[in-house]
Amino acid sequence: AWELTILHTNDVHSRLEQTSEDSSKCVNASRCMGGVARLFTKVQQIRRAEPNVLLLDAGDQYQGTIWFTVYKGAEVAHFMNALRYDAMALGNHEFDNGVEGLIEPLLKEAKFPILSANIKAKGPLASQISGLYLPYKVLPVGDEVVGIVGYTSKETPFLSNPGTNLVFEDEITALQPEVDKLKTLNVNKIIALGHSGFEMDKLIAQKVRGVDVVVGGHSNTFLYTGNPPSKEVPAGKYPFIVTSDDGRKVPVVQAYAFGKYLGYLKIEFDERGNVISSHGNPILLNSSIPEDPSIKADINKWRIKLDNYSTQELGKTIVYLDGSSQSCRFRECNMGNLICDAMINNNLRHTDEMFWNHVSMCILNGGGIRSPIDERNNGTITWENLAAVLPFGGTFDLVQLKGSTLKKAFEHSVHRYGQSTGEFLQVGGIHVVYDLSRKPGDRVVKLDVLCTKCRVPSYDPLKMDEVYKVILPNFLANGGDGFQMIKDELLRHDSGDQDINVVSTYISKMKVIYPAVEGRIKFSTGSH
């Protein structure tokens, strides 16, 4: 028998420095977690003590904090090189700055293979990107070889900016021939490493013949066997075992997100490359693990540029700004209210005596809110804090939509409610009531909007044929998170100001903020 240790990360989202337990900015160092310096200590400890070790990343290193805002991916290449990653799969966020923003800082600088079998380049891009990412890579590990085959969510064109010259194929259809190719090369131990979410990971384990292990990402899935060590609730045991269509037991793993855990999976193979056993657990990277001094020194060196950029106080909050996915993807959250209020405030234009303002409404996808802000840091809010909340470098845009389109958008907001998906809308200038006992597409039972053509603003029922102005993220205007109806039906689209700047300006203007949850979004009795 031959034993392989797979160490894996996914959805690190620019958390190069240690963070608080909820993956926002580290406030009390003695209770902070993760970060590449701490990760390196653990990785080096395991590499020293165990014989056959691979360090893999399942995508979405890009995007999430000021590190990415400032360094744009150069930091990912540098520190992943320093940690000596063995391979990485492309995630959807690796395309957030377009293909060029992937090629120059990361693909050209990485000293490890970057993989995706289901992304096919065409047109002029094909020759430019050739060889910079691969469908698979065969890695020597001890006296054996291991094949790593990559995959990326086929939803990436809806989630990011890969442009028109990359085709995202169905994962299973694309993976099978690559795995078959590896088999013909006499590679009998194959890991599928990718970024399509836990449901697809399980499907790949079930459907792709020859895949021995699936290491995934995208859905921030936390798996654990036994008593979990922190706040995350396991979605299943680690590893999650899928019985493949050809009768094999295939371990599937994922390691939550934000570098809080290091996935640790031990696989035992027989001489024919069959998995005999698999066991392990994510390792919580808490403060009992010291930060590596060499990596930490490098982090501090790179930090200097960020400090100049980001550490000035913009204003104060006297309340917790709840930007957690557990809140903002399920119900009204005060972080959503704050951002929408800032968006409206940024668009105050008193150009007509008939109107108190030209726009009163804001919608914001809950999935775009990426971090909370703790008020217990003296209430201080910095650009850096906001960059963790709104890491995508988007803009808040002005669109004109018919009432019927807005109604469709709100139906879409809850069409698959409860799965922690990003399309759940936070709002401003809108009162919505949902009845989740009704079938998807018919769950909006009340939708009132704040009048604009009035001296005393009040809420009136939405009129299907009326044209409304709405402030929203450019992501939504472009049909992101499945809001195709907005993209297809908008009557006018004017691009606006940078998202973080809108919120920072508002906080600076207000000086002290205390946004509340105030009944903008309600669920009718008995259904929530």
């Epitope: 200590t41 080096q44 400890q45 020293r48 003590a49 165990e50 014989p51 693990i289 010291p290 930060e291 590596d292 001094p293 060499s294 020194a297």
Partner: antibody, heavy 116, light 107 residues
Framework: VQLQESGPGLVKPSQSLSLTCTVT?????????WNWIRQFPGNKLEWMGY???????KYNPSLKSRISITRDTSKNQFFLQLNSVTTEDTATYYC??????????WGQGTTVTVSS | DIQMTQSPSSMYASLGERVTITCKAS??????LSWYQQKPWKSPKTLIY???NLADGVPSRFSGSGSGQDYSLTISSLESDDTATYYC?????????FGGGTKLEIK
């Protein structure tokens, strides 16, 4: 975590030195790296080698031809064997456990004299 | 092998005095350095790890500093209990190597 060295206090030149380290309060297969370190009469310290929780072994190249570190997981013990000893191997021998590269846990040491 | 040169090899200091012991590596060891205190007939005890981090249970009068090739251990106010021999260890590269030791005695 407690470590206790044991073995003969006197070894003849050209013979083999064999020492045992018994670990209590921690399984030697769960984690940590288990080291042998010696201290010569002039107080100079020398790292000799380790065996990890998974059985990986690393030796100081200066001793590589003479040293062997093994373990008995059922007894939670690890062992040092040093062959072809000379009077230069007279020292206090320590076993030590380390989690993150520095030696956090030490035995009390056992003195070995090489003499005919 | 990386050589660790410790100085002084012995020293006398008064109670309450600030004491500094230095360790120089023959190459950059990137702060992979720990400090140990050994009292007569006892085994060494970790004081500092990763050059600057105080080990659990170690009094705060002990501190470590340095980077690259040059490191130091400081006792801010010497106490009688600090009579011992102090060693540095580099664990950045195998084989791990110790400094020659500094014997500290009370004046």
């Amino acid at each position: 975590v407690q470590l206790q060295e044991s073995g003969p206090g006197l070894v003849k030149p050209s013979q083999s030195l064999s020492l045992t380290c018994t670990v209590t309060g921690h399984s030697i297969t769960s984690d940590y790296v288990w080291n042998w370190i010696r201290q010569f009469p002039g107080n100079k310290l020398e790292w000799m080698g380790y065996i990890s929780y998974s059985g990986i072994i690393k030796y100081n190249p200066s001793l590589k031809s003479r040293i062997s570190i093994t373990r008995d997981t059922s007894k939670n013990q690890f062992f040092l064997q040093l062959n072809s000893v000379t009077t230069e191997d007279t020292a206090t021998y320590y076993c030590a456990g380390d989690e993150y590269f520095w030696f956090a846990y030490w035995g009390q040491g056992t003195t070995v004299t090489v003499s005919s | 092998d990386i050589q660790m040169t410790q100085s002084p090899s012995s020293m006398y200091a008064s109670l309450g005095e600030r004491v500094t012991i230095t360790c120089k590596a023959s190459q950059d060891i990137k702060s992979y350095l720990s400090w140990y205190q050994q009292k007569p007939w006892k085994s060494p005890k970790t004081l500092i790890y990763y050059a600057t981090n105080l080990a659990d249970g170690v009094p705060s009068r002990f501190s470590g500093s340095g980077s690259g090739q040059d490191y130091s251990l400081t006792i801010s106010s010497l106490e009688s209990d600090d009579t011992a021999t102090y060693y540095c260890l580099q664990h950045g590269e195998s084989p791990y190597t110790f400094g020659g030791g500094t014997k500290l005695e009370i004046k």
